[in-house]
């Protein structure tokens, strides 16, 4: 990896052992200023593999609310507006980082956690398994 | 929101002001034990709106490597295997949290940051804008 010289103005880290504990400023910086969030807001309905969005809430997690996509159909919508089972709707999943309160119910202490979320759905050609 | 009783075993938080600084344990807990990550690994190629994955690396960010999807075509792949512009390939985007080293190059001090990433692509019916 790239070795970066340490900034002499860094805060001291007491705990040098692994698991590593770091300081995190929760005042979120949003890098998405140039993007229009409305742009993709209706894709879930216009897609040939449409999906519904389900709210997943967990007060012990940060962010506490995550939206989970569930494909509406097993097949994809064809040109006639019918569900075509020659194609498959599948969820596109992504691993994301969240903060889990640890110990539980603590406002200022967290542990990093990886979770898998479904972001939307796409239409794929099915893999045909032939029986010998 | 839900009010949670504070755990008496929580670490003390010195900084009560906003921006709030919290302690985070970077020993990642992976909740994805029941899922097979290989499952969706070839969707990018089998989709009617296929995509390429581009590596985005930033040593000042945690995680330092993020994979960004870019749709291969503006149209979608039809049954004949041609790119059909009567339908549109679009990226499915998701806002995710990352940690940004702050001050720069510090190993133990971060700020939470929201970034928008494209996870994959889906095929949508285009909105036809008629000129008056």
């Amino acid at each position: 990896g790239i070795t970066i010289p340490r900034n002499p103005g860094c805060p001291n880290s007491e705990d040098k052992n692994f698991p590593r504990t770091v300081m995190v400023n929760l005042n979120i910086h949003n890098r998405n200023t140039n993007t229009n969030p409305k742009r993709s807001s209706d894709y879930y309905n216009r897609s040939t593999s449409p999906w519904n969005l389900h709210r997943n809430e967990d007060p012990e997690r940060y962010p506490s609310v995550i939206w989970e996509a569930k494909c509406r159909h097993l097949g994809c919508i064809n040109a006639d507006g019918n569900v075509d089972y020659h194609m498959n709707s599948v969820p596109i999943q992504q691993e994301i980082l969240v903060l889990r309160r640890e110990p539980p119910h603590c406002p200022n202490s967290f542990r990093l956690e990886k979770i898998l979320v479904s972001v939307g759905c796409t239409c794929v050609t099915p893999i045909v398994h032939h029986v010998a | 929101g839900i009010t949670i009783p504070r755990n008496p075993g929580c670490p003390n938080s010195e900084d009560k002001n906003f921006p709030r600084t919290v302690m985070v344990n970077l020993n990642i807990h992976n909740r994805n034990t029941n899922t097979n990550p290989k499952r969706s690994s070839d969707y990018y190629n089998r989709s009617t709106s296929p995509w390429n994955l581009h590596r985005n690396e930033d040593p000042e960010r945690y995680p330092s490597v993020i994979w960004e999807a870019k749709c291969r075509h503006l149209g979608c792949i039809n049954a004949d295997g041609n790119v059909d512009y009567h339908m549109n390939s679009v990226p499915i985007q998701q806002e995710i949290l990352v940690l940004r080293r702050e001050p720069p190059h510090c190993p133990n001090s971060f700020r939470l940051e929201k970034i928008l990433v494209s996870v994959g692509c889906t095929c949508v019916t285009p909105i036809v804008h008629h000129v008056a």
Epitope: N36, R39, R46 | P50, K70, C71, R72, H73, L74, G75, I77, G81, N82, V83, Y85, N88, S89, V90, P91, V124, P126, I127, V128, H129, H130, V131
Partner: antibody
Framework: EVHLKESGPDLVAPSQSLSITCTVS????????VHWVRQPPGKGLEWLVV???????TYNSALKSRLSISKDNSKSQVFLKMNSLRTDDTAMYYC????????????WGQGTTVTVSS | DILLTQSPLSLPVSLGDQASISCRSS???????????LHWYLQKPGQSPKLLIY???NRFSGVPDRFSGSESGTDFTLKISRVEAEDLGVYFC?????????FGSGTKLEIK
């Protein structure tokens, strides 16, 4: 350096077929798409067809029945075949590289002149 | 098919002048992904076209900053802030949002 060069016959008889080759260098056909565009003498530009980096194609539907496009990645060549030529197919034929993700034609060949005449 | 109407057909200018070329589309060129695939090319006499501007306002590599592109709905404009001798030729707008990809009929930039 990116380079595209068209090669083919100067003269084709009406009702015959035309085959043109675009030989590229400085980039791979597995990474970039290639378009064919033509320009009749003293006129504007007409887009014909594109073969994308993944081998998929998109045709101008007005000409699709007479056109076919293919490529050989290992030889860095793209092939255009046009059937049932008419005198109004007389034009300069260009191949051009697709600007990946921007869908513009960023580099063009010098063109090859095709005259349809008996 | 999308019709791109360019005006003027001919634009006589003096060197150092500003030049402005218009391209009007018969339909919106905004793709579902939010991008507008309208490009500008210059074809000098006896040469193949060269890409100047892609996606409305992005200058292609090596293109001088005197060239700029803008849009207002379905009206697109190419501006040359100070015309130089090497800028003379025929300018084409082109769209790749819809198939078939189409070109405008061209605007000939010439010396007054």
């Amino acid at each position: 350096e990116v380079h595209l060069k068209e090669s083919g016959p100067d003269l084709v008889a009406p009702s015959q077929s035309l085959s043109i080759t675009c030989t590229v260098s400085g980039f791979s056909l597995t990474t970039y798409g290639v378009h064919w565009v033509r320009q009749p003498p003293g006129k504007g530009l007409e887009w014909l067809v594109v073969i994308w980096s993944d081998g998929l194609t998109t045709y101008n539907s007005a000409l699709k029945s007479r056109l076919s496009i293919s490529k050989d990645n290992s030889k860095s060549q793209v092939f255009l075949k046009m059937n049932s030529l008419r005198t109004d197919d007389t034009a300069m034929y260009y191949c051009a590289r697709d600007y990946t993700y921007e869908y513009a034609m960023d580099y063009w060949g010098q063109g090859t002149t095709v005259t349809v005449s008996s | 098919d999308i019709l791109l109407t360019q005006s003027p057909l001919s634009l006589p200018v003096s060197l150092g002048d500003q030049a402005s070329i218009s391209c009007r589309s018969s339909q919106s060129l905004v793709h579902s992904n939010g991008n507008t695939y309208l490009h500008w090319y210059l074809q000098k006499p006896g040469q193949s076209p060269k890409l100047l501007i892609y996606k409305v306002s992005n200058r292609f590599s090596g293109v001088p900053d005197r060239f700029s592109g803008s849009e207002s709905g379905t009206d697109f404009t190419l501006k040359i802030s100070r015309v130089e001798a090497e800028d003379l030729g025929v300018y084409f707008c082109s769209q790749s949002t819809h198939v078939p990809f189409t070109f405008g009929s061209g605007t000939k930039l010439e010396i007054k």
